[in-house]
Interface confidence: medium
């Protein structure tokens, strides 16, 4: 059952990176509008994006309340200009989203190398601890705050003069690696949550190389 001349939303898809979470769907509306509802399994339906002609709805404010909860959303279709109008059975058409658990499923954003510092044959590489939209006590938590030791970083590094890559891993945001004296190195990092079954890895960070502006080069 449903509303005459409206079509149900389809292809409901969660798009989420570092907990910034948007629900997308199709089709582009023709003479209809949408309202989204979201709930947790232990929560209740909350309406968002009232009577919108968009085909996306930012649900970040809801999911950051508890990123370990599992969320379900649904998209209602109403005829444009008469949102009280419903079909013969009295209900607007709606479609359910897949379930979404932010902690397990949000994509890890591309990390950034904050700095690197060489001291003799050691280089300390620091990864920027990206701020998320998850709040605690009115402050925004970083990715490390949220994931703790579940989050590791993999460092790829190589001599500027060769293509042979080495790797290092850390469950903090810092690497301390051995390098050959007098050689310039390039670095790239990747965020990883090894315990996950999906969305385990981020894309690689932009490459940073010694001898460029970034970081600090000190030979002692």
């Amino acid at each position: 059952s449903g509303t005459t001349n409206t079509v149900a939303a389809y292809n409901l898809t969660w798009k989420s990176t570092n907990f910034k979470t948007i629900l997308e769907w199709e089709p582009k509306p023709v003479n209809q509008v949408y309202t989204v509802q979201i709930s947790t399994k232990s929560g209740d339906w909350k309406s968002k994006c009232f009577y919108t002609t968009d085909t996306e709805c930012d649900l970040t404010d809801e999911i950051v309340k508890d990123v370990k909860q599992t969320y379900l959303a649904r998209v209602f279709s109403y005829p444009a200009g008469n949102v009280e109008s419903t079909g013969s059975a009295g209900e607007p058409l709606y479609e359910n989203s897949p379930e979404f658990t932010p902690y397990l499923e949000t994509n890890l954003g591309q990390p950034t190398i904050q700095s690197f510092e060489q001291v003799g044959t050691k280089v300390n590489v620091t990864v920027e601890d990206e701020r998320t939209l998850v709040r605690r006590n009115n402050t925004f938590l970083s990715l490390r705050d949220v994931f703790g030791k579940d989050l590791i970083y993999t460092l790829y590094y190589w001599k500027s003069s060769s293509s042979g890559k080495k790797t290092a891993k850390t469950n903090t945001n810092e690497f301390l690696i051995d390098v050959d004296k007098g050689e310039n190195y390039c670095f790239s990092v990747q965020a990883v949550i090894p315990s996950r079954t999906v969305n385990r890895k981020s894309t690689d960070s932009p490459v940073e190389c010694m001898g460029q502006e970034k970081g600090e080069f000190r030979e002692i």
Epitope: S42, G43, K65
Partner: antibody, heavy 118, light 107 residues
Framework: QVQLVQSGAEVKKPGASVKVSCKAS????????MHWVRQAPGQGLEWMGM????????SYAQKFQGRVTLTVDTSTSTAYMELSSLRSEDTAVYYC???????????WGQGTLVTVSS | DIQETQSPSSLSASVGDRVTITCRAS??????LNWYQQKPGKAPKLLIY???RLHSGVPSRFSGSVSGTDFTLTISSLQPEDFATYFC?????????FGQGTKVEIK
């Protein structure tokens, strides 16, 4: 264990307002919605509205829109239901009940009898 | 608003009887149908949620099922403490609504 303790019975005159409190304990107050349901003497149950204590977002049944106000005080884990412009047909037992899933009420207060009489 | 029509509105039964109460929703509610028990002067108690899931602490003689748009609460063997009023309630669509109740009395 989860407990919802409501304020005592009230007698009000038509046109007046009443404010019923519901003190929650045994769980994290801001994690679960609080709903209000009323029951007139010898009648069925009627859902009035709900509030999300984490951000005070409310949703009311159309019938009560404009007459009911749900609020929370997170510092004391207390929810409030205020009903204005009372009439005799508002005589009922008012329950607070904790949401435990979409439209699912697993925990209830003991009820507060509100009598509207001139 | 969605309406739930409960039947019967009352019934008389004996201890040990199998009792069935039906609730028909006026429109689709997925499986968001819950059952409550209420005794005089007391708050309702959740028995069954999401059509057929038994709430913790509820005896296994209570069960729920659905066939089409008809939702059923069954008490397999009525006990003395089961004499009460039973309500169905839909949690799919706002506003949430209850059936008018079924009073189970001693024969």
């Amino acid at each position: 264990q989860v407990q919802l303790v409501q304020s005592g019975a009230e007698v009000k005159k038509p046109g007046a307002s009443v404010k019923v409190s519901c003190k929650a304990s045994g769980y994290t107050f801001t994690t679960y919605w609080m709903h209000w349901v009323r029951q007139a003497p010898g009648q069925g149950l009627e859902w009035m509205g709900m509030i999300d204590p984490s951000d005070s977002y409310t949703s009311y049944a159309q019938k009560f829109q404009g007459r009911v106000t749900l609020t929370v005080d997170t510092s004391t884990s207390t929810a409030y239901m205020e009903l204005s412009s009372l009439r005799s047909e508002d005589t009922a037992v008012y329950y607070c009940t904790r949401g435990s899933g979409p439209g699912l009420f697993a925990y209830w207060g003991q009820g507060t009898l509100v009598t509207v009489s001139s | 608003d969605i309406q739930e029509t409960q039947s019967p509105s009352s019934l008389s039964a004996s201890v040990g009887d199998r009792v069935t109460i039906t609730c028909r929703a006026s429109q689709g509610i997925s499986n968001y149908l819950n059952w409550y028990q209420q005794k005089p002067g007391k708050a309702p108690k959740l028995l069954i949620y999401h059509t057929s899931r038994l709430h913790s602490g509820v005896p296994s003689r209570f069960s729920g099922s659905v066939s089409g748009t008809d939702f059923t609460l069954t008490i397999s063997s009525l006990q003395p403490e089961d004499f009460a009023t039973y309500f169905c309630q839909q949690g799919n669509t706002l506003p949430y609504t209850f059936g008018q109740g079924t009073k189970v009395e001693i024969k």
